[in-house]
């Protein structure tokens, strides 16, 4: 229960807090988990332990692994577990899911981007800011203390967004990067872009040859009127009416309204006896309106088929 | 789930969802019911952030709430109707990305049942 997620890239600084608090006075412990091993508290290691803080100075793949703290005091011992994953730089522009921090919202009225877990660091202004990997230009952006302010939103403005500073540790300097994403939201607090929520971008469906299996595309819409907010299917970047496939057909699932007035709609895709080919289609789920088009793409793999027992 | 149970109209009941083995800083948590012969319905979602978004149905009677220390969900039902006689189910999905329509959640609760009677 007591266990938190944490997650760095390689030669970067990493500091994780032990998910038990504890006043300051406490001694905290650092263990490996699968070894036991006390982690040293000697500045001088790479990896050290200081009070409620784990240092990766600078972190490796090898460090991913669980880290036990034991926050310990007269009366009694709490015990907390880090999970710390390590990954690779990446070559390219695109960053994976796993390495984002929580999605923020901003609308017109407030749109301050927090750089996740810089309190743990030792840093000094300025922050750098990117936006899906360009530095950050203009007169609109103002770095500020720990976050970023964005002057007049649009919903262009959307986006994944990498701070950048340095930790300092007894003199020594050490990047850190840390990424999450940006959504503009209405006054009445929802993305005016189309959401998809389901299918997961890039997700693999797995299917059984010969069986019939359904796919549904669900976007939600922004508050107030939309005069044009769609949910369909393409395969292969065609619309399924001019698809041609007969046994392939999609039909407009649930729909709902919100509160607040969110829309949201389904679209299923019915796929009578799948058959091989099937699965060398690019099956695209659409959300549009006004403010734009977001899609997600499906695959099918073959799954194997289930084990009758007789 | 649990909190279920039968109710005179009008009355209130507090549901409950514990969750274990989860430890993701994105997820978004959702309140369905369904009636026999019917589809999910979604009542509440509540993310992350915190962002919380009720059904139109709802109309100001139920509130989504968690403790994250107990990795609890809950939902607070006042002023039940006869209407509102369904099994509820809670569900939660890894994005903080959030609505409650029944095709973005992955993991399902087994369900609660809550009876209204006039």
């Known amino acids: 229960k007591f266990s938190k997620q944490s997650w760095g890239l390689e030669n970067e600084a990493l500091i994780v807090r032990c998910p038990r608090q504890g006043k300051p006075s406490y001694t905290v412990d650092w263990y490996y988990s699968q070894t036991n091993k006390s982690i040293p508290t000697q500045e001088r290691n790479r990896v050290f332990a200081s009070g409620q803080l784990l240092k990766f100075l600078p972190a490796a793949v090898a460090d991913s692994g669980i880290y036990t703290c034991i926050v310990r005091s007269p009366t009694f011992n709490r015990t907390g577990y880090a999970n710390v994953t390590i990954y690779k730089k990446q070559s390219d522009c695109n960053v994976p899911d796993y390495l984002m921090y929580s999605t923020v919202s901003g609308s017109e009225k407030n749109s301050k981007i927090y750089c996740p877990t810089i309190d743990l660091y030792n840093w000094t202004a300025p922050l750098e800011w990117f936006k899906n990997c360009q530095a950050l230009q203009g007169s609109r952006y103002r770095a500020h203390k720990s976050f970023l302010v964005i002057d007049n939103v649009m919903t262009e403005d959307a986006g994944d967004y990498t701070c950048k500073f340095i930790h300092n540790e007894n003199g020594a300097n050490y990047s850190v990067t840390a990424t999450r994403s940006f959504t503009v939201k209405d006054e009445q607090g929802f993305s005016l872009f189309p959401v998809i929520g389901a299918p997961a971008q890039n997700e693999i469906k797995e299917v059984e040859i010969g069986k019939n299996a359904n796919l549904t595309c669900s976007a939600c819409f922004g508050k107030g009127t939309q005069f044009l907010a769609a949910v369909l299917w393409q395969l292969n970047g065609t619309k399924i009416t001019d698809f041609g496939e007969p046994r392939i057909q999609q039909e407009e699932g649930q729909n709902q309204s919100f509160s607040n007035g969110l829309a949201c709609l389904d679209m299923v895709l019915r796929i009578a006896d799948v058959k091989e080919e099937d699965l060398l289609l690019q099956y695209d789920c659409l959300a549009l309106n006004l403010h734009g088009l977001r899609r997600h793409t499906v695959r099918l793999s073959r799954k194997n088929p289930s084990k009758e027992c007789f | 789930e649990s909190g279920g149970g039968s109710v005179q109209a009008g009355g209130s009941l507090r549901l409950s969802c514990a969750a274990s083995?989860?430890?993701?800083?994105?997820?978004?948590m959702g309140w369905f019911r369904q009636t026999p012969g019917k589809g999910r319905e979604g009542v509440a979602s509540i993310n992350s952030d915190g962002t919380t978004i009720y059904g139109n149905f709802v109309k100001g009677r139920f509130t989504i709430s968690e403790d994250n220390a107990k990795n609890t969900l809950y939902l607070q039902m006042n002023s039940l109707k006869p209407e509102d006689t369904a099994m509820y189910y809670c569900?939660?999905?890894?994005?903080?990305?959030?609505?409650?329509?029944?095709?973005?959640?992955?993991?399902w609760g087994q369900g609660t049942q809550v009876t209204v009677s006039s």
């Open positions: 569900a939660a999905r890894v994005d903080s990305t959030c609505a409650p329509m029944p095709s973005w959640f992955t993991y």
């Open positions: 083995g989860y430890t993701y800083s994105r997820y978004c």
